[in-house]
Interface confidence: medium
């Protein structure tokens, strides 16, 4: 007959690593006589034999957790007692290992530029997963604005347009990697005016284009206000490219006004607006434009017949009692003055005076005269007729003109529209547009209108040595 023997645990419990939903087994091998009674505890709490999550076999020497949960973490002990000697105990830990799991994934976010955005990414896993973020196809780098928080969330300070895009978070530990779904960060930008409309000082009956460019996300809409009310006339052309809206308001100017460009976009239930204003004033460069009373008709006079384009419509000013006779008389008087000028100056001056007094005319509801382009006026005044112009201005200052000469129809160049700005808004003087082969001689009054581009009349390229460098105001 065997002698009684106190229990001895021959295989002490060891630490067991187990994955969630997998099986974990603790073995507690005991030698004793008589056979011991073996009980199991978890964190010092007795495991009940009828708990269906556990299986206890081999006379209690094997404890199996049938489907490990992350809450099964803890210290498991087996206690063996057979009444001989004291009870014996061995303990081991269960470490529940867990592949990364994203418990709170990021969601789509719309945020206004300049604010702070937080994309959540809460994770579980053992070992604790490290969290990183991907934007588009590339790993996202942290910087002074962009940080991954301890919680795994992505925080972006002072959100910029370039932060917009698709993001996903990545949770990684030694057991695996988990990816969130792609989410979209949309950055909304308050409407902002990039290019404000410019103020214009124009002649009556001019066409003016006011341009306003705005940016924003969503793309703003642009509306125009004239003197506080919606614009009643004019045409608006709009184009959108790369989130920039370009609006051009073309106006036919018959009165001065304050024009405001308003750019608006919507952010949720709120709107953002930006405004810029420009004035359009009417330059008083001649009385006839001030009242702009007149009509368009073919030129039937003689003095400017060779200068003006054949069959062209010209503007006649009805502030004169008999406009056609009055204007012809004015040009006739001016013509006599021109007899004394140099052969270089005369054709240019004739072209200037004829085109200024008999301006090209656009018929319509309001007949519109088209003034000479500023650059052509300057070329006549400063290049072709520099000496004469200086002398004439000197006489004017000293009051030496004979009766009626104060009406000499000489434009003030600086008040005329620039061809550089809008080549369609003014009249060119064809006699200043030379043929290449005519550079060395002054063209006849009936020369054609090709273009060449010499800046002045240097002695090296022309047969007459003319210095254009005279001071003119």
């Amino acid at each position: 007959e065997k002698l009684p023997k106190a229990p001895v645990i021959t295989t002490p419990l060891e630490t067991v690593d187990a994955l969630v939903e997998e099986v974990a087994t603790f073995m507690c091998a005991v030698e004793s006589y008589p056979q011991p009674e073996i009980s199991w505890t978890r964190n010092k709490i007795l495991i009940k034999l009828f708990d269906t999550r556990y299986s206890i076999r081999e006379n209690g020497q094997l404890l199996t957790i049938l489907s490990v949960e992350d809450s099964d973490d803890g210290i498991y002990c087996c206690i063996a007692n057979n009444g001989v000697g004291g009870a014996v105990e061995s303990c081991g830990a269960l470490q529940v290992k867990m592949k990364p799991k994203i418990t709170r994934p990021p969601i789509n976010v719309k945020i206004i530029e300049g604010l702070k955005a937080v994309l959540p990414c809460t994770t579980m896993g053992n070992p604790k997963p490290s969290v990183s973020w991907i934007k588009g196809d590339n790993a996202l780098r942290e910087n002074s604005r962009i940080a991954v928080l301890e919680s795994g969330s992505l925080r972006i300070h002072n959100v910029q347009k370039e932060d917009a895009g698709q993001y996903r978070c990545v949770a990684k530990n030694s057991l695996g990697t988990a990816y969130s779904k792609l989410v979209k960060l949309e950055v909304e930008v308050f409407a902002r005016i990039l290019r404000a409309p410019e103020s214009h000082n124009v002649t009556f009956g001019s066409f003016v284009t006011l341009r306003c460019t705005a940016i924003g996300i969503p793309v703003p809409t642009i509306s125009w206000i004239e003197n506080g009310n919606a614009v009643s006339s004019g045409s608006i052309q709009e184009s959108v490219k790369d989130r920039v809206i370009d609006s051009r308001l073309q106006l036919f100017i018959t009165k001065p006004g304050l024009y405001t460009c308003i750019a608006t976009n919507k952010h949720g239930e709120k709107f953002s607006t930006a405004k810029a204003a420009a004035t359009v004033s009417i330059a008083e460069w001649s009385k006839s434009q001030k009242d702009s009373q007149g009509y368009c008709a073919q030129y039937r006079g003689e003095v400017c017949d060779a200068v003006l384009a054949k069959d062209a419509l010209v503007f006649f000013n009805t502030s004169y009692r008999d406009p056609e006779d009055a204007q012809e008389l004015l040009i006739h008087t001016a013509w006599n003055e021109l007899k004394a000028v140099s052969p270089l100056c005369r054709p240019a001056a004739e072209a200037l005076l004829c085109n200024h007094l008999f301006q090209e005319c656009s018929p319509g509801v309001v007949p519109t005269p088209m003034p000479i382009c500023r650059e052509y006026c300057l070329a006549v005044k400063e290049l072709f007729c520099a000496k004469e112009w200086q002398a004439m201005e000197g006489k004017a200052h000293r009051g030496l003109y004979r009766s009626g000469m104060h009406l000499l129809p000489v434009p003030e160049c600086s008040k005329l529209p620039s061809m550089h700005r809008d080549p369609t808004a003014c009249t060119r003087l064809p006699y200043l547009d030379y043929k290449k082969e005519n550079i060395t001689t002054f063209p006849s009054i009936t020369s054609s209108r090709p273009s060449a581009d010499i800046p002045n009349l240097p002695a090296s390229t022309s047969s007459f040595a003319v210095s254009p460098a005279y001071s003119m105001t």
Partner: antibody
Framework: EVQLVESGGGLVQPGGSLRLSCAAS????????IHWVRQAPGKGLEWVAS????????YYADSVKGRFTISADTSKNTAYLQMNSLRAEDTAVYYC?????????????????WGQGTLVTVSS | DIQMTQSPSSLSASVGDRVTITCRAS??????VAWYQQKPGKAPKLLIY???SLYSGVPSRFSGSRSGTDFTLTISSLQPEDFATYYC?????????FGQGTKVEIK
């Protein structure tokens, strides 16, 4: 969109030669003037040469006259600056610029479009 | 050659200040004078042409004027983006000349 793109710059020894090109697009090359303007390191702008495409007339600064030649190929919309007998004082960023407008009018326009510049270094 | 003498060669100013830069031609010239703005490492940009015409897209705080052989560029209310070097240029004669430049710095 108007564009001017210079090329051909680089390092050259004193007495050597270089040819700069200015490729133009977005405007009517044949009725514009093309200018070369240079800027020595830390210095101001210095006009070098001009060509008036439709007439072929050319003008040069005294400092480069006889050494530099400006030309244009209107079929290729390209202007050139042939630089010979280069000196250390020719070291600069060379810009090409254009001004529009016909004949006399062009001088009133200013140089409204410029290239990004190309660096010419003359050093032994 | 026509010389363009620009003054001052540099100036310090604050945002909101009115700034005036002058160019004096060595002899009588036409209105074929332009003003440019240049920032470091960039090409110049046209501001004013024909002595007083504002180039398209240039803010209206910039203006140009002429009195005899003196040409003036005025910035009515200096903005942060206006700190740069400014040049005048004449093309009144076939030999173009630039002023020596005025650097506008932050005070």
């Amino acid at each position: 969109e108007v564009q001017l793109v210079e090329s051909g710059g680089g390092l050259v020894q004193p007495g050597g030669s270089l040819r700069l090109s200015c490729a133009a697009s977005g405007f009517t090359f044949s009725s514009s003037s093309i200018h070369w303007v240079r800027q020595a390191p830390g210095k101001g702008l210095e006009w070098v040469a001009s060509i008036y495409s439709s007439s072929g007339s050319t003008y040069y600064a005294d400092s480069v006259k006889g050494r530099f030649t400006i030309s244009a190929d209107t079929s290729k919309n390209t202007a050139y600056l042939q630089m010979n007998s280069l000196r250390a004082e020719d070291t600069a960023v060379y810009y090409c610029a254009r001004s529009g407008g016909e004949f006399y009018i062009t001088s009133y326009y200013g140089m409204d479009y410029w290239g990004q510049g190309t660096l010419v270094t003359v050093s032994s | 050659d026509i010389q363009m003498t620009q003054s001052p060669s540099s100036l310090s100013a604050s945002v909101g200040d009115r700034v005036t830069i002058t160019c004096r031609a060595s002899q009588s010239v036409s209105s074929a004078v332009a003003w440019y703005q240049q920032k470091p490492g960039k090409a110049p940009k046209l501001l004013i042409y024909s002595a007083s015409s504002l180039y398209s897209g240039v803010p209206s705080r910039f203006s140009g004027s002429r009195s005899g052989t003196d040409f003036t560029l005025t910035i009515s209310s200096l903005q942060p983006e206006d700190f740069a070097t400014y040049y005048c240029q004449q093309s009144s004669s076939s030999l173009i000349t630039f002023g020596q430049g005025t650097k506008v710095e932050i005070k």
